[in-house]
């Protein structure tokens, strides 16, 4: 039992996060999704193509990853944006680019941001631009939690398997 | 104890970085390579210096990491680029900077991009510039697969152990 | 069973993050820290709030993560910087932004840079700016090693749990 034979402080720590027992301790949930390049003005995640995969219980639901079992996961995502120069006749307006990984759990009535990256781009005359954003971190997640992404600047995404992706793996 | 009952070379490796003992001698292949700072116009990966290492079967061949056993790996890389302002007499031309991790496998007759990041830089008068790119993700790899990198903008790399690196570890 | 024989409050805490049980109680040290948003001109790491945590031996000392046991760890950090346009009356001076994860070890009498990212920003008239930096890699660390960060541009940090963080986990 957690906390048995431990010093009081160690026992207290052990009790804070009960652990779940997995048969054979061999399952290693992992997922890597890529943005569907056939959907140009949306970001739809796919796991059944190229180098994408769902392993050991990860599943997709409404463009979200479903957490297969409670525990700590490393969650990551990348996007690459590109754009052309603005035309001399048009006004150059700043572009707000952002990418966020969010957690939806019915504990909260809203999506909780887990990972956020942001950039302001000021397109110039005759100046095409490119910008990459990546982030990843470890989070304590619960079975059934939903991981999704929100992106500002979707029309500017460079959709390819190596540039736009979203994944997670159990630690 | 680290190094006990090992061959001399294995014992030497074991002593370099004491490691956690895992029941059943579970192997955890991992590698972290750094860009050789003595090679200014190329990107040569090194594992025998500073904080770089090859563990549990990873090896380096033709500047590529060789995957030691089939499974899921987290693969990552970072580069940092820098440049000076262009001189007033010179024309400022845009610089395309890119860094890619590629897979070469017996399954494919070409290098498959796994991770790509890109940036356009427009050097200005009296304006030195700096740019960092990082990416990483989980991939299903096969024993013998080769992981390599391709970089556009190599002369602009800031080659130090903490700025330019490439690594992978088994999940 | 987790939560059995605990006080109600302890049992409630125990239920907060059910985790996978690993055979032989194999410990999986992990930590995720977030920048304290109440400290605007410094970067203080916190583990007792939002989605931050310290697990299986990680602890925080003098704003550094203490490595609980020798082994290979994946270490990561992110910062997001923002700024307003400079006023027409003021001179626009370039801003050097940098973020570094450092190692302080009894082996070395100084802080060793592990991960470094850098950026030069040139604020323009009426042009607010945003910039994100992320990095992470695998390192061989020794019990008692201290992992800390150094940041240039702290007044410009966008301090929120999803934008500024620092973490590590044992492989």
């Amino acid at each position: 039992l957690p906390g048995v034979g431990l010093t009081p402080s160690a026992a207290q720590t052990a009790r804070q996060h009960p652990k779940m027992h997995l048969a054979h301790s061999t399952l290693k949930p992992a997922a890597h999704l890529i943005g569907d390049p056939s959907k140009q003005n949306s970001l739809l995640w796919r796991a059944n193509t190229d180098r994408a995969f769902l392993q050991d219980g990860f599943s997709l639901s409404n463009n979200s990853l479903l957490v297969p079992t409670s525990g700590i996961y490393f969650v990551y995502s990348q996007v690459v944006f590109s754009g052309k120069a603005y035309s001399p006749k048009a006004t150059s307006s700043p572009l707000y680019l952002a990418h966020e990984v969010q957690l939806f759990s019915s504990q909260y009535p809203f999506h909780v941001p887990l990972l956020s990256s942001q950039k302001m781009v000021y397109p110039g005359l005759q100046e095409p631009w490119l910008h990459s954003m990546y982030h990843g971190a470890a989070f304590q997640l619960t079975q059934g939690d939903q991981l999704s992404t929100h992106t500002d600047g979707i029309p500017h995404l460079v959709l390819s398997p190596s540039t736009v992706f979203f994944g997670a793996f159990a630690l | 104890l680290p190094g006990v009952g090992l061959t001399p070379s294995a014992a030497q490796t074991a002593r370099q970085h004491p490691k956690m003992h895992l029941a059943h001698s579970t192997l955890k292949p991992a590698a972290h390579l750094i860009g050789d700072p003595s090679k200014q116009n190329s990107l040569l990966w090194r594992a025998n210096t500073d904080r770089a290492f090859l563990q549990d079967g990873f090896s380096l061949s033709n500047n590529s990491l060789l995957v030691p056993t089939s499974g899921i790996y987290f693969v990552y890389s970072q580069v940092v680029f820098s440049g000076k302002a262009y001189s007033p007499k010179a024309t400022s031309s845009p610089l395309y900077l890119a860094h890619e991790v590629q897979l070469f496998s017996s399954q494919y007759p070409f290098h498959v991009p796994l991770l790509s990041s890109q940036k356009m830089v427009y050097p200005g008068l009296q304006e030195p510039w700096l740019h960092s790119m990082y990416h990483g993700a989980a991939f299903q790899l096969t024993q013998g697969d080769q992981l390599s990198t391709h970089t556009d903008g190599i002369p602009h790399l800031v080659l130090s152990p903490s700025t330019v690196f490439f690594g992978a570890f088994a999940l | 069973l987790p939560g059995v024989g605990l006080t109600p409050s302890a049992a409630q805490t125990a239920r907060q993050h059910p985790k996978m049980h690993l055979a032989h109680s194999t410990l999986k040290p992990a930590a995720h820290l977030i920048g304290d948003p109440s400290k605007q001109n410094s970067l203080l790491w916190r583990a007792n709030t939002d989605r931050a945590f310290l697990q299986d031996g990680f602890s925080l000392s003098n704003n550094s993560l203490l490595v609980p046991t020798s082994g290979i760890y994946f270490v990561y950090s992110q910062v997001v910087f923002s700024g307003k346009a400079y006023s027409p009356k003021a001179t626009s001076s370039p801003l050097y932004l940098a973020h570094e994860v450092q190692l302080f070890s009894s082996q070395y009498p100084f802080h060793v840079p592990l991960l470094s990212s850098q950026k030069m920003v040139y604020p323009g008239l009426q042009e607010p700016w945003l910039h994100s930096m992320y990095h992470g890699a695998a390192f061989q660390l020794t019990q008692g090693d201290q992992l800390s960060t150094h940041t240039d541009g702290i007044p410009h940090l966008v301090l929120s749990p999803s934008t500024v963080f620092f973490g590590a986990f044992a492989l």
Epitope: L27, F53, G57, S59, T69 | - | P2, R15
Partner: antibody, heavy 118, light 107 residues
Framework: EVQLVESGGGLVQPGGSLRLSCAAS????????IHWVRQAPGKGLEWVGY????????NYNEKFKGRFTISSDKSKNTAYLQMNSLRAEDTAVYYC???????????WGQGTLVTVSS | DIQMTQSPSSLSASVGDRVTITCRAS??????VAWYQQKPGKAPKLLIY???HRYTGVPSRFSGSGSGTDFTLTISSLQPEDFATYYC?????????FGQGTKVEIK
């Protein structure tokens, strides 16, 4: 030993409501979701949705959203399926199931029969 | 929703026979397929997950294979207790869906 016991089934008129219960034992109730799966007489299996007792997180098959609600009571180690506006085609054996990994229905109750008929 | 189509819908076999049941998904589901066994009046039992991994306690005569859209459950040597209905299930995306079942009867 993991045990799931359903109750609350029976005969109900079209348009009526019914609440099914699933009493769980033999494991930490808050560590796993509870799924509901139904099987019409002589037909295949159909996933209804799940509830996570730890945080009350839910996910439904769109087909059942609005009419069916899945909930749980931690203090009683019991999950519930509230069914409203019942139709003849809802006649089925309703099972609760506990997964190992989320989408793998590893443990099942014995099932409870719901008959919708006038 | 992803449709799972099993074939055959029923088959007759003898003890010791090698039995193969196939399942086709309406779209690629990677390796995210599970197989269940159900006997009359009983709840289903998990046999295989992730296309080819046997669940704890399942006899080695049960094996699964396939990826993408086509999957197979094989019973290498049919035993008396194996006469039942078998269902495939995709666990690639919600709503998780099942095949219509394959009834294995005694010849």
């Amino acid at each position: 030993e993991v045990q799931l016991v359903e109750s609350g089934g029976g005969l109900v008129q079209p348009g009526g409501s019914l609440r099914l219960s699933c009493a769980a034992s033999g494991y930490t109730f808050t560590s796993y979701v509870i799924h509901w799966v139904r099987q019409a007489p002589g037909k295949g299996l159909e996933w209804v949705g799940y509830n996570n007792p730890y945080n009350d997180g839910t996910n439904y098959n769109e087909k059942f959203k609005g009419r069916f609600t899945i909930s749980s009571d931690k203090s009683k180690n019991t999950a519930y399926l509230q069914m409203n506006s019942l139709r003849a085609e809802d006649t089925a054996v309703y099972y609760c199931s506990r997964p190992t990994m989320l989408p793998w229905f590893a443990y099942w109750g014995q099932g409870t029969l719901v008959t919708v008929s006038s | 929703d992803i449709q799972m189509t099993q074939s055959p819908s029923s088959l007759s076999a003898s003890v010791g026979d090698r039995v193969t049941i196939t399942c086709r998904a309406s779209q690629a589901v990677s390796s995210a397929v599970a197989w269940y066994q159900q006997k009359p009046g009983k709840a289903p039992k998990l046999l295989i997950y992730s296309a080819s991994h046997r669940y704890t306690g399942v006899p080695s005569r049960f094996s699964g294979s396939g990826s993408g859209t086509d999957f197979t459950l094989t019973i290498s040597s049919l035993q008396p207790e194996d006469f039942a209905t078998y269902y495939c299930q995709q666990h690639y995306s919600t709503p998780w869906t099942f095949g219509q079942g394959t009834k294995v009867e005694i010849k």
